[in-house]
Interface confidence: low
């Protein structure tokens, strides 16, 4: 009989006995010669390694590639397959030899003590008891005990085969503790060795791989995969692995049972696959299959093997993130990399640390984003092995719904002199800038704050008949100026102005600003009076420690009893859009002030002087005058703002720079402070003087050095000073290149 596929050039080895089956008697000599076309080897039963003393394999004397196998005095146990094969190939010729030994018809096992057969209680499963025969045509039955039962071949599911053993449905002998085969020869009974029957379970609950997913390694690293099978009791498990590079030299497989708690209804088995130094060919799907004979469960995971440690940003990494003030912002660091990189976040170059407002990790999370969070966030990925870094900048733009600056000044009804031209402003801060600012108005009398129409939190506007400013029928003649843009307190703001040509009617005006993320509004009470008039001397906002006078001028023939008051601490909460009670009707909230009276030919002038104004002097000042005829009181309110003294600060930095000879340098130094600071420039600590090449503009804010020369190199300092001190910034300007020699004729 031949085994294996014939190759192109080799014939099968040829045996001297040209039979598939040979039957010989015990105690005779077995001799078979094998001839071929290259180096040959023999394999024989029981001892497959060739070290048995009784077996002799010799080279033939009459030719190359020829070997003779000789066994003198054969015994029943020599029964089996004898194979002659070419080394390192599958090409082989086989003969099955029966050594008839009627005193020992069963081939004894190596242990010669007892065997074990494993069975499952399954109707469809058969079990083979391996009692092989040295005689092919024996009458064999199977004895099971206890209680004793005998099973004879029935030509169907119970059978005996000399090369295989006794086959029987496993459930038939599952009750038994042991079984053996029995042969009758000439009324003589011969028994095989005993086989202990072990009933095993088969149910596998699950197979789990660890790590279960996302396994990444780089070439040369060790891969360790654990496969755990959980089964019912009495289960034996066979593990089988499938993986990309199955011919791996550095592969190691270790299988073991895991201890489970006593009383547990479950067993655990573990198979560990280890590859000491992975290569790219080890990348792929790894499948662990656990089999109990009747049941197989498997699990798979993908192992990615990188050429070397690396890190790169994923294609989904954002470059621009937009958010609205107050929102939670999440910026994930999307990367491709092995091993996972260390992630560090920076804002405008400064490392970010996690706290209660910000979490800087795999995802940068800002709990409640504010405007100051706007900026460039750099995420730096560092490969922990190669230390290679990759950086990516994400610009965070925080949108701000429109905020109207004047709205924060809680002031009562300002009074405006009849017939005067007045300008109302709404200074809007919004990001992005508002796409429109609209003005609306309504008559004050339509919105009278009568007791019957008490303003409440639930009804902040007792009137809502707002009209467009284009329709000024019955009101003041209005003109809306084109929006202006101004840098106020370091912020770009939009200023919308409404010009009332002649203040004839008391009214309410509302500005409404809208941008992509929201809206804001401000209601201005425009109360027109023919009464006194307040002016400020000097006519500007005072700064702390400066002096200011408030002048109240009234026509002497119409008014008398001029008195200055200051509105006390806010008497009632002012709700959004609420109109305060007219001050003349509520003198309880006013504090009387000392003032000096002057008169000219037509007017009385009551002057209230504030020397060394302080922040406490801010507030609403009321001038009260009484009509000589009707005795009706007229009030005028003026809000006074005192600017805080602020030491000079310089916004932004001067950058060190390198410039070539002949080029120009332009730098800016923006300073703020109150009083406004004076700006001076120094080079190498010497005052910088303007000349043809050095130009200072905009109150020394901008410095230009034209056609730079080598001697312009040095340390430049911008210094901003006021009575409150100085601030300075420095930068070093390097001038490159050789100085051209100038020939003056």
């Amino acid at each position: 009989a031949s085994v294996g596929l014939p190759s192109v050039s080799l014939d099968l080895p040829r045996l001297s006995i040209q039979k598939d089956i040979l039957t010989i008697k015990a105690n005779t000599t077995l001799q078979i010669t094998c001839r071929g076309q290259r180096d040959l080897d023999w394999l024989w039963p029981n001892n497959q390694s060739g070290s048995e003393q009784r077996v002799e394999v010799t080279e033939c004397s009459d030719g190359l590639f020829c070997k003779t196998l000789t066994i003198p005095k054969v015994i029943g146990n020599d029964t089996g397959a004898y194979k002659c094969f070419y080394r390192e190939t599958d090409l082989a010729s086989v003969i099955y030899v029966y050594v008839q030994d009627y005193r020992s018809p069963f081939i004894a096992s190596v242990s010669d003590q007892h065997g074990v057969v494993y069975i499952t209680e399954n109707k469809n499963k058969t079990v083979v008891i391996p009692c092989l025969g040295s005689i092919s045509n024996l009458n064999v039955s199977l004895c099971a005990r206890y209680p004793e039962k005998r099973f004879v071949p029935d030509g169907n599911r119970i059978s005996w085969d000399s090369k295989k053993g006794f086959t029987i449905p496993s459930y038939m002998i599952s009750y038994a503790g042991m079984v053996f085969c029995e042969a009758k020869i000439n009324d003589e009974s011969y028994q095989s060795i005993m086989y202990i029957v072990v009933v095993v379970g088969y149910r596998i609950y699950d197979v789990v791989l660890s790590p279960s997913h996302g396994i990444e390694l780089s070439v040369g690293e060790k891969l360790v995969l654990n496969c755990t099978a959980r089964t019912e009791l009495n289960v034996g498990i066979d593990f089988n692995w499938e993986y990309p590079s199955s011919k791996h030299q550095h592969k190691k497989l270790v299988n073991r049972d895991l201890k489970t708690q006593s009383g547990s209804e479950m067993k655990k088995f573990l198979s560990t696959l280890t590859i000491d130094g992975v290569t790219r060919s080890d990348q792929g799907l790894y499948t662990c299959a656990a089999s109990s004979g009747l049941m197989t469960k498997k699990n798979s995971t993908f192992v990615r093997v990188h050429e070397k440690p690396f890190v790169a940003f994923g294609s989904g990494m954002e470059s621009l993130v937009e958010a609205t003030v107050g929102e939670r912002v999440r910026i994930p660091a999307k990367y491709l990399g092995y091993p996972p990189p260390e992630i560090k976040w920076y804002k405008n170059g400064i490392p970010l640390e996690s706290n209660h407002t910000i979490k800087a990790g795999h995802v940068l999370t800002i709990m409640e984003v504010s405007e100051r969070d706007t900026g460039n966030y750099t995420v730096i990925l560092t490969n922990p092995i190669s230390k290679e870094k990759q950086s990516h900048v994400v610009s965070l733009v925080v949108y701000v719904p429109p905020q109207i600056g004047e709205k924060s000044l809680i002031s009562p009804v300002d009074s405006y002199q009849y017939g005067t031209t007045q300008t109302l402003t709404c200074t809007v801060y919004a990001i992005p800038p508002p796409h429109h600012i609209h003005w609306y108005w309504q008559l004050e009398e339509e919105c009278a704050n009568e007791p019957s129409q008490a303003v409440s939190v639930t009804n902040p506007y007792p009137c809502e008949e707002w009209r467009s400013v284009e329709d000024f029928q019955g009101g003041n003649k209005i003109e809306v100026n084109k929006n202006q843009f101004a840098l106020i307190e370091g912020k770009n703001k939009t200023v919308s102005t409404l010009v009332i040509q002649a203040a004839n009617v008391s009214a309410l005006y509302k500005c409404e600003a809208v941008n992509k993320v929201g809206r804001g509004e401000r209601v201005i009470s425009f109360h027109v009076t023919r009464g006194p008039e307040i002016t400020l001397q000097p006519d500007m906002q005072p700064t702390e420690q400066e002096s200011v006078s408030l002048w109240c001028t009234a026509d002497r023939s119409t008014f008398e009893n001029l008195t200055w008051y200051k509105l006390g601490p806010q008497p009632l909460p002012i709700h959004v859009g609420e109109l305060p009670t007219p001050v003349c009707k509520n003198l309880d909230t006013l504090w009387k002030l000392n003032a000096t009276m002057f008169s000219n030919s037509t007017n009385d002038i009551l002057i209230m002087e504030l020397k060394n104004a302080s922040l406490q002097d801010q507030g609403d000042y009321v001038c009260l005058a009484q009509d000589r005829k009707t005795k009706k009181r007229h009030c005028v309110v003026r809000q006074l703002t005192v600017l805080e003294r602020v030491a000079p600060t310089i916004t932004g930095n001067l950058e060190n720079q390198t410039t070539s000879i002949g080029e120009s340098i332009e730098v800016s130094c923006t300073a703020s402070g109150n009083p406004p600071p004076q700006i001076m420039w120094f080079k190498d600590n010497e005052t910088l003087v303007e000349d043809s090449g050095i130009v200072l503009k905009d109150g020394n804010r901008n410095l230009t050095i034209r056609r730079v020369r080598k001697e312009d190199e040095g340390l430049y300092t911008c210094q901003a000073c006021s009575v409150l001190g100085c601030a300075k910034v420095e930068a070093f300007f390097i001038i490159e290149g050789a100085q051209e020699k100038t020939n003056l004729e």
Epitope: A312, F313, E388
Partner: antibody, heavy 121, light 110 residues
Framework: EVQLLESGGGWVKPGGSLRLSCAAS????????MTWVRQAPGKGLEWVSY????????YSADSVRGRFTISRDNAKNSVYLQMNSLRAEDTAVYYC??????????????WGRGTMVTVSS | LPVLTQPPSVSAAPGQKVTIPCSGT????????VSWYQQLPGTAPKLLIY???KRPSGIPDRFSGSKSGTSATLGITGLQTGDEADYYC???????????FGEGTKLTVL
């Protein structure tokens, strides 16, 4: 003007070497990964190699790995392809390409005109 | 074997609509942005679509891109004779860790 200009192509015998250059202008070169793509006569586009902004990471197609080396000089706004052990199958038009986004490996919105490399004996 | 599969050729009459499919796998099309390129005879490729469905400025809205699962599609409406060209899809492949192009599709305007 934003552009890429390749040079250095020509005829070479199998086993020989060539160095291709790509000069970039009109954009912040050091902010972009740079890529070489080739196209054999009558065939489709084949990605050859790319290099990250600082030149620390390079990836190459299996067909050229070990023979071709990509490098860059950010000061000169240039990217190079050193081609050694050239084979007949390396005959192609070689394009230099820039990805659409900074710090991104692909999606090429800027291409050079290409330079022809012919490998034959 | 090509990583991204495209039909070798497609054809349609002027004014008609044509679609060019590009088939890939989980590691490329599913996980990454797809871009499309047009290569007119004798010229360098030109970016038509990026990020699956976005058009660079200057690309008419007759060209559109879409992606679903492991497939991406380039659509061209109102075909013109000037659209006769080779069209390539491209994307990053996470497993191969390299950029991959489709084999290319020749568009003929009948």
């Amino acid at each position: 003007e934003v552009q890429l200009l390749e040079s250095g192509g020509g005829w070479v015998k199998p086993g020989g070497s060539l160095r291709l250059s790509c000069a970039a202008s009109g954009f912040p070169f050091s902010d972009y990964y740079m890529t070489w793509v080739r196209q054999a006569p009558g065939k489709g586009l084949e990605w050859v190699s790319y290099i990250t902004t600082g030149g620390r990471i390079i990836y190459s197609a299996d067909s050229v790995r070990g023979r071709f080396t990509i490098s860059r000089d950010n000061a000169k706004n240039s990217v190079y392809l050193q081609m050694n052990s050239l084979r007949a199958e390396d005959t192609a038009v070689y394009y230099c390409a820039r990805p659409l986004r900074e710090l991104s490996p692909g999606g090429f919105d800027l291409w050079g005109r290409g330079t022809m490399v012919t490998v034959s004996s | 074997l090509p990583v991204l599969t495209q039909p070798p050729s497609v054809s349609a009459a002027p004014g008609q609509k044509v679609t060019i499919p590009c088939s890939g796998t989980y590691s490329n099309i599913v996980n990454n942005y797809v871009s499309w390129y047009q290569q007119l005879p004798g010229t360098a490729p030109k970016l038509l679509i990026y990020d699956n469905n976005k058009r660079p400025s200057g690309i008419p809205d007759r060209f559109s891109g879409s992606k679903s699962g492991t497939s991406a599609t380039l659509g061209i409406t109102g075909l013109q004779t000037g659209d006769e060209a080779d069209y390539y899809c491209g994307t990053w492949d996470n497993s191969l860790r390299r950029w991959v192009f489709g084999e290319g599709t020749k568009l003929t305007v009948l």
